[in-house]
């Protein structure tokens, strides 16, 4: 009765358990009772990343600059090329097949997390006491100016989009306050 299973680094062919080819090599010929599996290294710009019985190596991924892509890590005979996006852009998927511009946070919103090559900007609404008056992919919400520390008073209240406006203290009220 021929074998129905093989060990993990083997494959079943013609009632034989043949050795798989190591990562970085492709199958040229199956083993026989008297000859070992024959494997050959992948060519330039090709790879195989597992123990395998593939007769063709895979082509390295091309990081197309027209899609905003650049090489993050050059491929080897055992690994694929890893692409990332140009500065200011991020990948549209985990496979990073194309890029989109980082999103900006509108006025009233600040950057919670700056975008990376693989994740977009994360914005958050500016809470009470903070504001953002610009559309930006980098600016956080800024705290309102503290008029008191400048010995000024609030002349106009702040919003999530505007800072408070400080002005001088009322001299008369100030005078009465001290007498």
């Amino acid at each position: 009765e021929p074998p129905t299973a093989c060990r993990e680094k083997q494959y079943l062919i013609n009632s034989q358990c043949c050795s798989l080819c190591q990562p970085g090599q492709k199958l040229v010929s199956d083993c026989t009772e008297f000859t070992e599996t024959e494997c050959l290294p992948c060519g330039e710009s090709e790879f195989l990343d597992t123990w395998n019985r593939e007769t063709h190596c895979h082509q390295h991924k091309y990081c197309d600059p027209n899609l905003g892509l650049r090489v993050q890590q050059k491929g080897t005979s055992e690994t694929d090329t890893i692409c990332t996006c140009e500065e200011g852009w991020h990948c549209t998927s985990e496979a990073c097949e194309s890029c989109v511009l980082h999103r900006s946070c509108s006025p009233g919103f600040g950057v919670k997390q700056i975008a990376t090559g693989v994740s977009d900007t994360i914005c958050e609404p500016c809470p009470v006491g903070f504001f953002s008056n610009v559309s930006s992919a980098f600016e956080k919400c800024h705290p309102w100016t503290s008029c008191e520390t400048k010995d000024l008073v609030v002349q106009q209240a702040g919003t999530n989009k505007t800072d408070v406006v400080c002005g001088p203290q009322d001299r008369l009220r100030h005078h009465h306050h001290h007498h």
């Epitope: 060990r7 190591q22 009772e33 494997c39």
Partner: antibody, heavy 127, light 107 residues
Framework: EVQLLESGGGLVRPGGSLRLSCAAS????????MNWVRQAPGKGLEWVSY????????DYADSVKGRFTVSRDNSKNLLYLQMNSLRAEDTAVYYC????????????????????WGQGTMVTVSS | DIQLTQSPSSLTASVGDRVTITCRSS??????LAWYQQKPGKPPKLLIY???SLEGGVPSRFSGSGSGTDFTLTISSLQPEDFATYYC?????????FGQGTKLEIK
């Protein structure tokens, strides 16, 4: 230290059942294929069963097929051999053994061997 | 199933002797063969894998050769600790099988 320790052996009546365990330590158990090998008193070695690292693939000697089941719990570093419908001829010392794949990237395809063995547990099937 | 036949079944030799044990397979197994040493009351110990590769820590007086169907284990100069039983095993395909063993005794 890399170690395998079998337990669960003992005296059992013909037709009875027994579950052997093999506790692994000192290595990443879940990365290795494992085997059970037995040795009847005064006799040679007999391969009994094989299990892949994930437990997905198993194989058995014809003499135990349909009666013995090999399994593993990688979270507990344990290998098992469930033995049912035991016969007198199953009397033996049972060893668990680690399969290792030796590989030299510059050489020919790699080779297997059983590089770590437990001390064995005795199973006696007798009425 | 693949049968392995070891010869001789037993062998008497002296310290310093060169000893050869053979293992013949019923079908070609390329170099998918291992050799083990076993002493009474102990588990087997791996000596050779892939027909000719020496396991780490095994003395260089042990060597293996062969491919296909015919294999040999050679001990170039027997030491007192080498008196034991030796087994070949094919790991080419399931079911894995062992030779019947060669008992090496002191003269």
């Amino acid at each position: 230290e890399v170690q395998l320790l079998e337990s669960g052996g003992g005296l059992v009546r013909p037709g009875g059942s027994l579950r052997l365990s093999c506790a692994a330590s000192g290595f990443t158990f879940g990365s290795y294929e494992m085997n059970w090998v037995r040795q009847a008193p005064g006799k040679g070695l007999e391969w009994v069963s094989y299990i892949s690292s994930s437990g997905e693939t198993t194989d058995y000697a014809d003499s135990v097929k349909g009666r013995f089941t090999v399994s593993r719990d990688n979270s507990k570093n344990l290998l098992y051999l469930q033995m049912n419908s035991l016969r007198a001829e199953d009397t033996a010392v049972y060893y668990c053994a680690r399969d290792v794949f030796f590989f030299d990237s510059s050489g020919p395809p790699g080779a297997y061997g059983m590089d770590v063995w437990g001390q064995g547990t005795m199973v006696t099937v007798s009425s | 199933d693949i049968q392995l036949t070891q010869s001789p079944s037993s062998l008497t030799a002296s310290v310093g002797d060169r000893v050869t044990i053979t293992c013949r397979s019923s079908q070609g197994i390329r170099s998918s063969l291992a050799w083990y040493q076993q002493k009474p009351g102990k588990p087997p110990k791996l000596l050779i894998y892939g027909a000719s590769s020496l396991e780490g820590g095994v003395p260089s007086r042990f060597s293996g050769s062969g491919s296909g169907t015919d294999f040999t284990l050679t001990i170039s100069s027997l030491q007192p600790e080498d008196f034991a039983t030796y087994y070949c095993q094919q790991l080419n395909s399931f079911p894995s099988t062992f030779g019947q063993g060669t008992k090496l005794e002191i003269k």
